[in-house]
């Protein structure tokens, strides 16, 4: 593929780039060509060093396309004003740490100046710590250099985990790239993709990541690989003793006829079991419900209303033909 390279390619000021970096800003990673005339898959001649091939440089998966970039495969460096492992977190100015210094017009808080570790200058998973003058990178095994940018690891060392395919990296001066199998990510395929975080199971199904596959454990009334099918909850479900089936929320419910209860209306219900008659009223089971015979001085369907001494009741009015003390039918 075409590539414009100025005469000073491979130089940064007057300093030559350290292998495997080349290019005007020492940002292009190259490795020896696999054959005199062509480069391997995804690789191309790395001008101006025609005996090398350039590996495609890809940032860490998830690195923000707006606020992140990379200079080593698998890293994510943040542009000014952004932070976090994937450069998705704005540098906060909202917490007031000190009364001194310049303040933000919007919050009145101190705006911290850029620290030497902002944007994490340490590549390849190195951790950054501030020093009095600058910063220091603590590099993971297999990396070294000021910013952990130099890899001493080759494909021969098997740096790709979880069945990742290693490309490039024939010698310690060249970069390698891990092509991860489905379900894994990271510069060394070391991170399992939490596929359940995408909530693939619908209708409240429980997601199970089995490694080789995703499984959904569906709630009652739902089916399908992603619990996408809403089953007819009442299909084939009979409610006994004249009860009617009611669908709802992935489970069927029976609305039972009077005198019956339970999930399928198979249990004979004693309407008096709950002691519905207040103030010592006596309960009688009746074909249409229950009847309360109220103790003297009380009236109402559940004997809940006292009868006043002068004969007036607390009810607005007794229904015609119904005297205080008569049994009250509770429907």
């Amino acid at each position: 593929y075409p590539y414009d390279v100025p005469d000073y390619a491979g130089m940064l000021g007057s300093a030559r780039c350290e292998p495997p970096a080349v290019g005007t800003a020492c940002t292009r990673l190259c490795r020896p060509r696999s054959a005199p005339s062509r480069c391997g898959p995804g690789l191309r001649p790395c001008a101006p060093l025609e005996d090398e091939c350039e590996a495609p440089l890809v940032c860490r998966a998830g690195c923000s396309p707006e606020h992140g970039f990379c200079e080593q495969p698998g890293e994510c460096r943040c542009l000014e004003g952004w932070t976090g492992p994937l450069c998705t977190v704005p540098v906060s100015t909202s917490s007031c740490l000190s009364p001194r210094g310049p303040s933000s017009a919007t919050t009145g808080c101190l705006v911290p100046g850029p620290g030497p570790c902002d944007g994490n200058p340490c590549a390849n998973g190195g951790s950054c710590s501030e020093t009095p003058r600058s910063f220091e990178c603590t590099c993971p095994r297999g990396f070294y250099g000021l910013r952990c940018e130099v890899s001493g690891v080759t494909c021969a060392d098997g740096p790709c985990f979880n069945g990742g395919l290693c490309v490039g990296g024939a010698d310690p001066d060249s970069a390698y790239i891990c092509h991860c199998p489905p379900g894994f990510q990271g510069s060394n395929c070391e991170k399992r993709v939490d596929r359940c975080s995408l909530q693939p199971c619908r209708n409240g199904g429980l997601c199970l990541d089995l490694g080789h596959a995703l499984r959904c454990r569906c709630r009652a009334g739902f089916a399908g690989p992603r619990c996408e099918h809403d089953l007819d909850d009442c299909a084939g479900r009979a409610c006994a003793n004249g009860g009617t089936c009611v669908e709802g929320g992935g489970a069927h419910r029976c609305s039972c006829a009077l005198g019956f209860g339970g999930r399928d209306c198979r249990e004979r219900a004693d309407p008096c079991a709950a002691r519905p008659c207040a103030h010592g009223g006596r309960c009688y089971a009746h074909f249409s419900g229950l009847v309360c015979a109220c103790a003297p001085g009380y009236m109402g369907a559940r004997c809940e209303f006292p009868v006043h001494p002068d004969g007036a009741s607390a009810l607005p009015a007794a229904p015609p033909g119904l005297r205080p003390g008569d049994p009250q039918r509770y429907l």
Epitope: T24, A25, V58, A61, E66, F69, C70, P73
Partner: antibody, heavy 120, light 107 residues
């Protein structure tokens, strides 16, 4: 607030050279990691990537159009210029410029596009 | 170069329905695939990058999945403003390529 805006002729004749300018604000091409690219879209058709240029003057071109394309930047003016030689009616398209960060070869921020018609 | 094939070419659905769009790569692109939305007369807008990360300001009803060669964009419950053309794009190596697009239209 980042903005990108394309400008250039709306009509060019076959065999002529097209020169398009992308003027942007809210970021600088002197910032490490930042780049600007061009993408085109013929009427009713799909997007096609053309070229990219980065802060370090690294340039990338579409292989199918490499011989006809040149991308340059004017950092102080916040501009990127694309030239395309030997225009043909099939090059009639809306041309977009968009920002893309180094190693993160997606296009997160786009201009509104400019329609270029190639006709005699 | 990697060829991205999108299917279906056109998808006709109603608001509130679930949309599933597919993008297939001619060779593995790992998880380095993005989805864009384009409405008539507008520039494309980045929706999803690296297979399933949502871009800034994109509603949660948009989700992406897949890796290797097969990818899916899902819109869980379609809103009227979601009817547009959707493109996929890979960044696994040079040259960058886009799919031919899927038009999502109101039924």
């Amino acid at each position: 607030q980042i903005t990108l805006k394309e400008s250039g002729p709306t009509l060019v004749k076959p065999t002529q050279t097209l020169t398009l300018t992308c003027t942007f604000s809210g970021f600088s091409l002197s910032t490490r990691g930042v780049g600007v690219g061009w993408i085109r879209q013929p009427p009713g058709k799909a997007l096609e990537w053309l070229a990219l240029i980065y802060w370090n003057d690294d340039k990338r071109y579409s292989p199918s159009l490499q011989t006809r394309l040149t991308i340059t930047k004017d950092t102080p003016k916040n501009q990127v210029v694309l030239t395309m030689t030997n225009m043909d009616p099939v090059d009639t398209a809306t041309y977009y410029c968009a920002r893309s960060n180094w190693g993160n070869w997606y296009f997160a921020l786009w201009g509104r596009g400019t329609l270029v018609t190639v006709s005699s | 170069e990697i060829v991205l094939t999108q299917s279906p070419a056109t998808l006709s659905l109603s608001p509130g329905e679930r949309a599933t769009l597919s993008c297939r790569a001619s060779q593995s692109v790992s998880s380095y695939l993005a989805w864009y939305q384009q409405k008539p007369g507008q520039a494309p807008r980045l929706l999803i990058y690296d297979a399933f990360y949502r871009a800034t300001g994109i509603p949660a009803r948009f989700s992406g999945s897949g890796s290797g060669t097969d990818f899916t964009l899902t819109i869980s419950s379609l809103e009227p403003e979601d009817f547009a053309v959707y493109y996929c794009q890979h960044r696994s190596n040079w040259p960058i390529t886009f799919g031919q697009g899927t038009r999502l239209e109101i039924k």
